[in-house]
């Protein structure tokens, strides 16, 4: 079988949620050595990087000026050691926002709730869309997707107090062009039916997988490299729509 | 057809009590909101009770002294309210699956015509 150096890790420095006209930037992370990185959207070739030098740093960073729908698909990237090419990367989805209009965003029975409500979200855009949105900050990755004519709901279900946080929503012209995000909806969820005063959120933290972590090499990160960059491989998990 | 009437409202001296009364009817709903607005106010938030189940849910600033109850029977929901203060005078609303917007107030299809509580010290 045809060999081939282990995958790169595809990330987007910041967000993968890019809003019109901003520059998107994406990182592709290899290997020290690398003489070039390739970045494909929706299978076909967009750009390529050759770092320099190869051997001082394990990854480049592919900036996408001028985000539009155009340029909001399936990006994948690969490297080359030599003549030896990597397989290809998991597959990151950049989206442009900011399309449009501005939904929105309600919850029922209200923003203050106890521990075992149901809770339910509602998006709401009056402008033709069907496809519907709903993340929470911090947690960018899990999306929720509902379906409606100009309002989706979200059903929540009992609430726990690991629901607490801030929440968005955004309409979908397709799964790559989103609307403007809706101001958020901020949920407190108190302990328990019978105590109801209010508890602070749990603080959120900007997700680790949207941060680009390219290193200069030192003497000892050489050694390190190829373990360091299987287990990411290993242990990254991607999202998909 | 549904419509929601609120009844009850009337003048008392500060420390007397009252009883709301918000009469639900055309269809079967979730929740029943019960909200105010003091002249030159914002609308505000006082309690709410899901009609399954008859969990509660107050405001802080009237804890502990206004009680929200359903008689499912009849398709009511009471507020009672005791050791009234001057600062609880207000026209209260009763609104069915009132739900809190982005835009910062609680939108909901169905609302009440309010009925007037007026607190003398």
């Known amino acids: 079988p045809k060999q081939t150096l282990p995958k790169p890790i595809i990330r987007a420095e910041s967000t993968y949620m890019v809003p019109k006209e901003k520059q998107a930037t994406l990182c592709c992370q290899g290997s020290y050595g690398a003489v070039e990185y390739q970045l494909h959207f929706e299978g076909s070739l967009f750009a390529v990087e050759r770092p320099k030098p190869p051997e001082r740093i394990n990854g480049v960073k592919f900036h996408i000026p001028d985000m539009n729908s155009r340029k909001a698909g399936r990006y994948s990237c690969i490297y080359r050691v030599g003549e030896l090419w990597s397989e290809r990367s998991d597959l990151l989805d950049l989206v442009v926002t900011e399309m449009y209009d501005t939904p929105t965003l309600s919850v029922h029975p209200g923003p203050e709730v106890t521990s075992g409500e149901k809770v339910t979200f509602y998006c709401r855009l009056d402008t033709a869309t069907s496809m519907f949105l709903l993340l929470k900050e911090g947690r960018s990755r899990d999306v929720q997707r509902s379906y409606g004519k100009v309002q989706a709901e979200f059903p929540m279900g009992p609430v726990t107090t690991a629901h607490r946080g801030s929440y968005r929503c955004f309409g979908s012209y397709n799964n790559y062009a989103w609307s403007f995000p809706s101001e958020p909806v901020k949920l407190l969820v108190t302990g328990d039916i019978e105590n109801t005063s209010l508890a602070p959120t749990d603080p959120t933290f900007p997700d680790s997988w949207d941060t680009c972590l390219l290193t200069r090499e030192t003497g000892l990160q050489k050694d390190l490299a190829l373990w360091d960059h299987t287990a990411q491989n290993h242990h990254h998990h991607h999202h998909h729509h | 057809q549904v419509q929601l009437v609120e009844s009850g409202g009337g003048m008392v001296q500060a420390g007397g009590s009252l009883r709301l009364s918000c009469a639900a009817s055309g269809r079967t709903f979730n929740t029943i909101h019960w909200f105010r607005q003091a002249p030159g106010k914002e609308r505000e938030f006082v309690a709410r009770i899901w009609w399954i189940g008859g969990a509660t849910f107050y405001a802080d600033s009237v804890k502990g002294r206004f009680t929200i109850s359903r008689d499912n029977t009849e398709n009511l929901v009471y507020l009672q309210m005791n050791s009234l203060k001057p600062e609880d005078t207000a026209v209260y609303y009763c609104?069915?699956?009132?739900?809190?917007?982005?835009?910062?107030?609680?939108?909901?299809?169905?609302w009440g015509p309010g009925t007037q509580v007026t607190v003398s010290s």
């Open positions: 609104a069915a699956d009132a739900r809190y917007t982005s835009h910062g107030y609680y939108e909901s299809d169905y």
